[in-house]
């Protein structure tokens, strides 16, 4: 998802020394940045998130604050301090004229400044059915555990709190921080001020229509009547519940925020802090029919994000948009008339559609998996959700083009049974933003925090790049995609894994001077090869060498084209059993594909050769997929021979750890 | 712990009015509405209404439709139920329960409608 | 709507089990049913919620692991093991049905359960 590629406006306000020495330079002289939203009529000016820097204090917060207004004063100006944060970002929220953006920006402590901008709520019975495994009757619905165990805090409107789908699950904090509605004339009627929080509180835990109806939930008044918030407003409520973590530890948490606003920085940035807290955040793709990384807090990577199906499994259409989609996608769920709690009266249903509703959805799924696993960790989650939604059932056609390949084909699904999925080697694909057109343009793919990249692949429509490696960064191997020279840009895509007690490590072979082509092999006694990724320095790769096919019998190791550098991913886990699996097409063809078997997992993806005619390779789910220019294009027919390389492992530690407790 | 106390008993003549309380404690009283169900002399419960503590919305069995009014105060976190055009058949112990869960229960108030 | 029918009476001796039956009209077997324990004298208490799958939520507060629920088809059980004392009393099943304005809870008649 997201990181900080985010397309959203950044302005840098240069720092003039000649300042009346008021404010101290920031240390380094480094410069603080202002962003704002994108979107025109979502922002708030006025209204600024002055975020300091990490390791800052509560009591330096206050003083930055201080002498902001102190500063602003003798300029004559009146400023407000709305809040002061800390327990989840350190900074202050302020009400001030934009002219003191420069002053603000050189504060001591300053990281960043964000304008306050708009959030929106993301809202317009096959729902049970669909995430039911087949061995349920959805007229019966009884899931396995109701997720007694965990706690769901949804961040929304007001509720109906006594509804009968909802009474005594869900506690009413006293937590509300809202905008004004808009209009002279709005006039609060309570059940339309109730409508969206009631719906998906009923679709979380309602006792008839919910997803988890064991869970008991809390709910944070972030959205008024009219279903709008503030990034401000949401990032109080985030802290809020960090706070209340902090005072009173209960078992796992899922926050559900079934809202989005433009993307934003500062939005993110506090999900990530609460995310590694262990607090599992699930949110709205967006009903924007739009990329979803240009929204928040859908674009946060820690974020489990939902697109809308509707119950043909096809991407919800609302009214001239529908739900979002992209890369920034985790899965997507039920979101289309999806019946729930009405606020009308205390024993009413209504049907309501959105990506709010499928959030909802895998709130509630979130919720039964943590209630039968409590120790189950956001990345264990994260690939149990992908692991057992429903595979390749979206028409990709819906989505634009461009966005087919980066959107996860995934419907959201209740494990057949919410214990014994232990043994099973989870792997995900996580595709980069795109580099761009420059010649030196890069894209980088990154993995959780407690996943390893097994491997890493490119892609590049054009079929013009310079490959892949991984490499180090911040102690962490991440997956770097060259472009190149005329080149539209290139994607990286890491496949990351869940595996407990990994040592991996990359090695690395140059490009070889005969040839014979390039080869690189794990050499550390108990290392296994994961996955083979191929970097070039040159423009073209030759497109008449012929493709370099692997020796038989030596399984670890990694061949290339004779100019490419060749990077083997190495890695060492109890039980690891790694093997390659090769598809080869003599004929030109398009696409290229090989799986793996049942009870093995697709780790590595790679094309051979690497020549320029391949556009990339990349994994969807356990099948290795390997993209080459259109036919009617490529010449000769050896040239046009691919091969599609997959490495499929599999953990007999984990298969027997799993066991031994059956 | 959870409690709902009723009001006393009450004598009332046939055409009169009876306004039963129900104040409740250990909860947080907006987060269940009040049912309101009844039991005539060596009969079976009857159930007549409900109402919402959090925006005072009412639903009424129809047999005692346009004769009763359900109430709440949640200043107090107490509920009321009034009871117009008393019949000799109204005659029963009032119940006063949380929720449509109706978890716990008053300890009813007996009205005695009586020429 | 459901209706629900229960025995006049039951009766089972110390220390012995007994089960009780409510049973639901035709076309809602799959309605949840809540049954209630009315010592003599006093206010009905929430035993617990039952449905085909058996309970539903929690149990009432105070109710002893002696008290379970079942459910098939029309049929919605509860049975008492180690029959106590103070275990002699009526027991009413009710379900809710409907929703909006149509929404009514139905009770059955109540069984009288004596104690030998």
């Known amino acids: 998802q997201e990181d900080e590629d985010g397309d959203y406006e950044e302005l840098v306000l240069a720092l003039r020394s000649e300042e009346d020495g008021l404010a101290e330079a920031p240390e380094h002289g480094t410069t603080a940045t202002f962003h704002r939203c994108a979107k025109d009529p979502w922002r708030l000016p006025g209204t600024y998130v002055v975020v300091l820097k990490e390791e800052t204090h509560l009591s330096q917060s206050e003083r930055t604050a201080r002498r902001l207004q102190a500063q602003a004063a003798r300029r004559g100006y009146l400023t407000k301090i709305l809040h002061v944060f800390h327990g989840l970002l350190p900074g202050f929220l302020v009400k001030m004229s934009g002219d003191l953006l420069e002053l603000a920006l050189k504060l001591p402590h300053v990281d960043y400044i964000e304008e306050d901008s708009s959030v929106f709520a993301q809202s317009i019975p096959w729902n049970l059915e669909r995430i039911t495994p087949p061995r349920y009757r959805a007229d019966e619905y009884q899931p396995p555990d109701g997720g007694s165990l965990v706690e769901v805090y949804l961040l929304d409107t007001s509720i109906q709190s006594d509804h009968r789908e909802i009474e005594g699950r869900v506690m009413v904090t006293d937590f509300e921080n809202v905008p004004e509605e808009d209009g002279t004339r709005f006039h609060r009627q309570a059940s339309k001020c109730d409508s969206h929080g009631t719906h998906l509180a009923g679709v979380v835990s309602g006792r008839d229509a919910g997803v988890a109806k064991g869970a008991s939930m809390r709910s944070l008044r972030v959205l008024n009547c009219q279903g709008k918030g503030t990034v401000s407003g949401t990032l109080i409520g985030l802290e809020f519940i960090r706070k209340s973590q902090l005072v009173q530890p209960v078992g796992p948490l899922v926050v559900l925020l079934p809202l989005a606003g433009g993307y934003s920085r500062v939005l993110n940035a506090a999900c990530q802090r609460l995310a590694r807290a262990g607090v599992v955040l699930v949110t709205a793709a967006g009903n924007f029919r739009d990329d979803a990384c240009l929204y928040s807090p859908a674009s946060a990577p820690e974020v489990i994000t939902v697109g809308a199906t509707n119950a043909q499994d096809q991407p919800v259409t609302l009214g001239t948009l529908g739900t979002n989609f992209g890369r920034c996608v985790d899965l997507f769920a039920p979101g289309e008339d999806i019946i729930g709690a009405s606020s009308d009266c205390s024993t009413c249903f209504v049907s309501q559609s959105g990506t709010s509703q499928a959030a909802a959805h895998v709130a509630g799924i979130a919720a039964m998996m943590l209630s039968a696993e409590p120790e189950l960790t956001l990345a264990e989650l994260r690939q149990r959700l992908i692991h057992f939604s429903a595979k390749d059932v979206i028409n990709e056609a819906w989505f634009p083009e461009d966005q087919r390949v980066l959107t996860p084909n995934l419907v959201a699904a209740l494990p057949p049974s919410t214990h014994g999925a232990g043994w099973q080697l989870f792997c995900r694909t996580v595709w980069s933003a795109h580099s761009g057109p420059t010649r030196m343009a890069t894209a980088v793919a990154r993995c959780a925090p407690d996943e390893e990249l097994l491997s890493c692949s490119s892609f590049s429509r054009s079929g013009k790049r310079r490959g892949e490696r991984m490499e180090a960064q911040g102690g962490k191997l991440v997956c770097r995609a060259h472009n190149a020279f005329g080149g539209e840009g290139v994607y990286a895509i890491a496949r990351c894994c869940l595996l407990p007690q990994a040592n991996c490590s990359v090695h690395t072979a140059p490009p070889a001077e005969a040839s014979m082509g390039t080869r690189v092999h794990c050499h550390q006694q108990g290392h296994v090869l994961t996955g083979c990724s191929s970097h070039w320095e040159v423009e073209d790769l030759g497109t008449h060498k012929p493709p370099v096919l692997r020796p038989r019998g030596q399984p670890n190791q990694c061949v290339g084209h004779r100019e490419a550098s060749i990077h083997a991913s190495c890695c060492h886990a109890p039980g690891l059993e790694c093997k390659v699996k090769e598809h080869g097409i003599p004929a030109p063809q398009e696409q290229v594909t090989v799986a793996c078997e049942e009870g093995w997992t697709l780790t590595g993806c790679s094309a051979l050769p690497g020549t320029s005619h391949v556009l990339g390779a990349y994994a969807v789910d356990n099948t290795c997929v390997v993209r080459s220019r259109d036919v009617s294009t490529t010449g000769s027919t050896s040239e046009g021979a691919v091969t599609a390389v997959a490495i499929c492992c599999r953990s007999r530690h984990l298969a027997q750890a799993s066991q031994e407790l059956q | 712990q959870v409690q709902l106390v009723q009001s006393g008993a009450e004598v009332k003549k046939p055409g009169a009015s009876v306004k039963v309380s129900c104040k409740a404690s250990?909860?947080?009283?907006?987060?269940?509405?009040i049912s309101w169900v009844r039991q005539a002399p060596g009969q079976g419960l009857e159930w007549m209404g409900w109402?919402?503590?959090?925006?005072?919305?009412?639903n009424y069995a129809q047999k005692v439709q346009g004769r009763v009014t359900m109430t709440t105060d949640t200043s107090t976190s107490t509920a009321y139920m009034e009871l117009r055009s008393l019949r000799s058949d109204d005659t029963a112990v009032y119940y006063c329960?949380?929720?449509?869960?109706?978890?716990?229960w008053g300890q009813g108030t007996l009205v005695t409608v009586s020429s | 709507q459901p209706v629900l029918t229960q025995p006049l009476f039951a009766s089972a001796s110390l220390g012995a089990s007994v089960t009780l039956t409510c049973t639901l009209s035709s076309g809602y077997s799959s309605y949840e049913v809540d049954w209630y324990q009315q010592r003599p004298g006093k206010g009905p208490r929430f035993v617990m919620r039952?449905?085909?799958?058996?309970?539903?939520?929690s149990k009432g507060e105070g109710i002893p692991d002696r008290f379970s629920v079942l459910g098939s088809g029309l049929n919605r059980y509860l049975t008492i093991k180690n029959i106590q004392e103070e275990d002699e009393s009526d027991y009413h099943c009710g379900a809710d049905h409907g929703s909006g304005t149509n929404f009514v809870v139905v009770f059955g008649g109540g069984t009288k359960l004596t104690v030998l």
């Open positions: 329960a949380r929720g449509y869960t109706r978890d716990y």
């Open positions: 109402i919402s503590t959090y925006n005072g919305n009412t």
């Open positions: 250990g909860y947080t009283f907006t987060s269940y509405g």
């Open positions: 039952v449905d085909t799958g058996g309970i539903v939520g």
